[in-house]
């Protein structure tokens, strides 16, 4: 602790100019004071001034008023500093002396004589208010006041609490009257060294180094660091914990970039045709009559369905068509014949068979020919036999399908797997994705093709639950849990009714 006992001398009266021994001063009592402050004693005794002592220069002769003086010789109030916890009690001895000698340092002069003394014992609390008193004896009167105040930076009832206001990285505070810290705005903690982050900043996922700031820890984002960052490359997915990629409805794949519902998302089929999903980014359009093309985007002519029979020629009209029949035929579609076998109506070596007692006929066509009169060469591509966008080509009596890259089979109905050539090393599992094969690697390997042996095995700690298989290698330091039926989650920790369509990335 540290404080100051202050004594303010106000007035001393010694009208007769007498000493304590009854003698008078000549020409007058040139008066100075000795003050002794010590611990409380019920009976004041001689001995060391344990709390301090001080002397004044000559302040006046016989009777005088003592003026306040802030510095130099004759300072008033008198200061008695102490460097301990103020006990709240004290004993004070004030002696008035006459000196025949030096005005400034009278206590060193020989021949000094006591005029009078007073003794005060009691309790005194620390505070700014002066306690005023007056002491009389038969010859003299002394008016004075006193108090105890704490030294700069000391606080509390006994001046025992040290507090120095500061505004640096070891504290941002001012000092309360009791010495406790009062944090400056934006700061908290015992020493006011902890910044108060932006209101709402997530306690675990965010932090700050200065007030009203919110810095996100790895894996989190947003103004309040309450939004997780999904796995890098996650396209149509979300996360509930960082680096997750939980696919939105209709999307699949490790990065949720496989469109499982292309029909709904893109509506590729035009002109009222029916769209059917057929795997990632796959779909087929079933056209309404009168339309064709991969997306049913091409309108057919009314004659496109070859409605005219027996070699009739078709003419498009505004909302319909008209058949011009060859000789011997009539009807809307030239379906009625006036010919008989006698007219040799069958072309291309077709055999004529009479019907209805010779009033009509039917042609039996040789291979590769068709039509009522065998007049049409068979087009084996008419039925669109080639799947997955394959091109149909007539080859004499047969036809072949020319397949798009990635498909094979007589009708291009088979998908050629990128995984067929086993691109994954070290027992990695291959997944056919839109942009090529992706390998999920066994423990201890990573890289696009599981070709890199890694020293840190992310699977070593057994992070996958419920019997899931752990793979590494999707990206450095990552692992993948391939969940068994009935479990999902980055570590296959959540039971559900349906199996996940792809492994989850942790």
């Amino acid at each position: 602790g540290s404080g100051i006992f202050q004594l303010r001398l106000q007035e001393f009266v010694n009208q007769r100019g007498m000493l304590a021994n009854g003698q008078s001063c000549e020409p007058g009592c040139r008066t100075f004071f000795r003050i002794c402050l010590k611990h409380f004693q019920a009976t004041f005794s001689e001995g060391p001034c344990t709390f301090g002592n001080v002397s004044t220069p000559v302040l006046g002769t016989n009777s005088f008023v003592v003026r306040d003086k802030n510095s130099g010789s004759g300072r008033n109030p008198l200061q008695l500093p102490f460097n301990f916890t103020w006990p709240g009690t004290f004993s004070l001895n004030i002696q008035a002396w006459h000196t025949p000698g030096d005005d400034l340092r009278p206590e060193t002069s020989p021949g000094n004589s006591l005029i009078s003394q007073i003794i005060i014992q009691g309790s005194l609390a620390v505070g700014k208010i002066w306690r005023t008193d007056e002491q009389n004896d038969t010859l003299t009167r002394l008016s004075y006041s006193y108090r105890v105040i704490c030294s700069d930076n000391y606080y509390g009832e006994s001046c025992s609490r040290l507090c120095k206001k500061r505004d640096d990285h070891f504290g941002h505070y001012e000092c309360q009257p009791d010495g406790s810290l009062s944090c400056l705005p934006g700061w908290t903690g015992k020493y006011c060294d902890q910044p108060i982050c932006l209101s709402g900043c997530h306690e675990q996922n965010g932090y700050c180094s200065k007030p009203d700031e919110c810095i996100c820890r790895p894996g989190w984002q947003g103004r309040l660091c309450n939004e997780c960052i999904p796995h890098n490359g996650c396209r149509h997915g979300t996360c509930s914990i960082p680096w997750q990629c939980a696919c939105d409805e209709g999307w699949g794949g490790l990065f949720c970039d496989q469109d499982l519902n292309y029909c709904t998302h893109h509506s590729p089929c035009k002109n009222g045709s029916t769209c059917s999903n057929s795997g990632p980014k796959g779909y087929t359009c079933t056209c309404l009559p009168g339309y064709t093309g991969e997306h049913c985007e091409l309108g057919l002519s009314k004659c496109a369905s070859n409605p005219c029979r027996n070699g009739g020629s078709c003419k498009d009209q505004e909302n319909s068509y008209h058949c011009l029949c060859p000789p011997g035929y009539y009807g809307q579609h030239c379906e009625h014949s006036t010919l008989t076998c006698a007219d040799s109506p069958c072309f291309n070596g077709g055999s004529c068979r009479e019907r209805n007692q010779g009033s009509s006929y039917a042609c039996e066509c040789p291979p590769n020919f068709t039509g009522s009169n065998c007049e049409k060469k068979v087009d084996r591509c008419t039925s669109n036999p080639c799947a997955n966008g394959g091109q149909c080509q007539n080859r004499g009596p047969s036809r072949t399908c020319r397949c798009r890259p990635g498909f094979t089979g007589t009708h291009c109905e088979l998908h050629i797997s990128d995984c067929a050539r086993s691109p994954c090393a070290h027992g990695g599992t291959c997944h056919d994705l839109e942009n090529g094969p992706v390998c999920t690697c066994p423990a201890g390997f990573s890289g696009r093709r599981c070709e890199v042996r890694i020293t840190h095995d992310a699977c070593a700690s057994g992070p996958c639950f419920n019997g899931a298989t752990c793979y590494t290698g999707l990206s450095p330091n990552n692992f993948v849990c391939n969940c068994p039926y009935g479990f999902v989650g980055s570590r296959c920790e959540f039971p559900v009714g349906l199996p996940p369509s792809f492994p989850w990335v942790a």
Epitope: N153, R166, H169, F170, Y191, D193, Q194, Y207
Partner: antibody
Framework: EVQLQESGPGLVKPSETLSLTCTVS??????????WGWIRQPPGKGLEWIGD???????YYNPSLKSRVTISVDTSKNQFSLKLSSVTAADTAVYYC?????????????WGQGTLVTVSS | SYELTQPPSVSVSPGQTASITCSGQ??????ASWYQQKPGQSPVLVIY???KRPSGIPERFSGSNSGDTATLTISGTQPMDEADYYC?????????FGYGTKVTVL
């Protein structure tokens, strides 16, 4: 008990960058209430405070060195580092790392043993 | 920039009291720390918060700080106290060391 250990090259060429790392053991660098500081002492001379950092990455530098100093922290490794660029012979000194304690009003209660860095071609 | 001034050297006889001063503008309004450094060793904190001793520091080390001066006092100085002593304070966010005082025990 907390221990600090400086590491880095003992010889650096003029105009190059001095790089030192302080590894903390026996306590977490992520604890609040501490700053982690660098102090240097040229041969036969007094101590000079270089700068400090806390776990959140808040840095404070001596204004006389600020343009050349970078202090960083790696909480995962329980380390903090000093980089001093464009060094000259005047940067030859024993470099200490130390823990500064808020409770001790910024006093440094734990110090590394120091590492001498000489700047010479 | 803020400066702390110390006497270069102080000599004391064994058993006597050594006082080392550290002066700086309004230093009494800042917290002063004192460090002891023996040749070839790292500094050791002997006083913090003007007058407090860390555990393990002998009672003969004491400190005070008011006005413009902080003082480290070694009562009953022993030969093992011979060392360099540095005062330190914080000026806003910058650590400042005194120039150091070499204490010689005669």
């Amino acid at each position: 008990e907390v221990q600090l250990q400086e590491s880095g090259p003992g010889l650096v060429k003029p105009s190059e960058t001095l790089s030192l790392t302080c590894t903390v053991s026996g306590g977490s660098i992520s604890s609040s209430g501490y700053y982690w500081g660098w102090i240097r002492q040229p041969p036969g001379k007094g101590l000079e405070w270089i700068g400090d950092i806390n776990y959140a990455g808040s840095t404070y530098y001596n204004p006389s060195l600020k343009s050349r100093v970078t202090i960083s922290v790696d909480t995962s490794k329980n380390q903090f580092s000093l980089k001093l660029s464009s060094v000259t012979a005047a940067d030859t000194a024993v470099y200490y790392c130390a823990r500064e304690d808020v409770i001790l009003r910024g006093g440094s209660d734990y110090w590394g043993q120091g590492t001498l860095v000489t700047v010479s071609s | 920039s803020y400066e702390l001034t110390q006497p270069p050297s102080v000599s004391v006889s064994p058993g006597q009291t050594a006082s080392i001063t550290c002066s700086g503008q309004r230093l009494g309004d800042k917290y002063a720390s004192w460090y002891q450094q023996k040749p070839g060793q790292s500094p050791v904190l002997v006083i913090y918060e003007d007058s407090k001793r860390p555990s393990g520091i002998p009672e003969r080390f004491s400190g005070s700080n008011s006005g413009d001066t902080a003082t480290l006092t070694i009562s009953g100085t022993q030969p093992m106290d011979e060392a360099d002593y540095y005062c330190q304070a914080w000026d806003r966010d910058t650590g400042v060391f005194g120039y150091g005082t070499k204490v010689t025990v005669l």
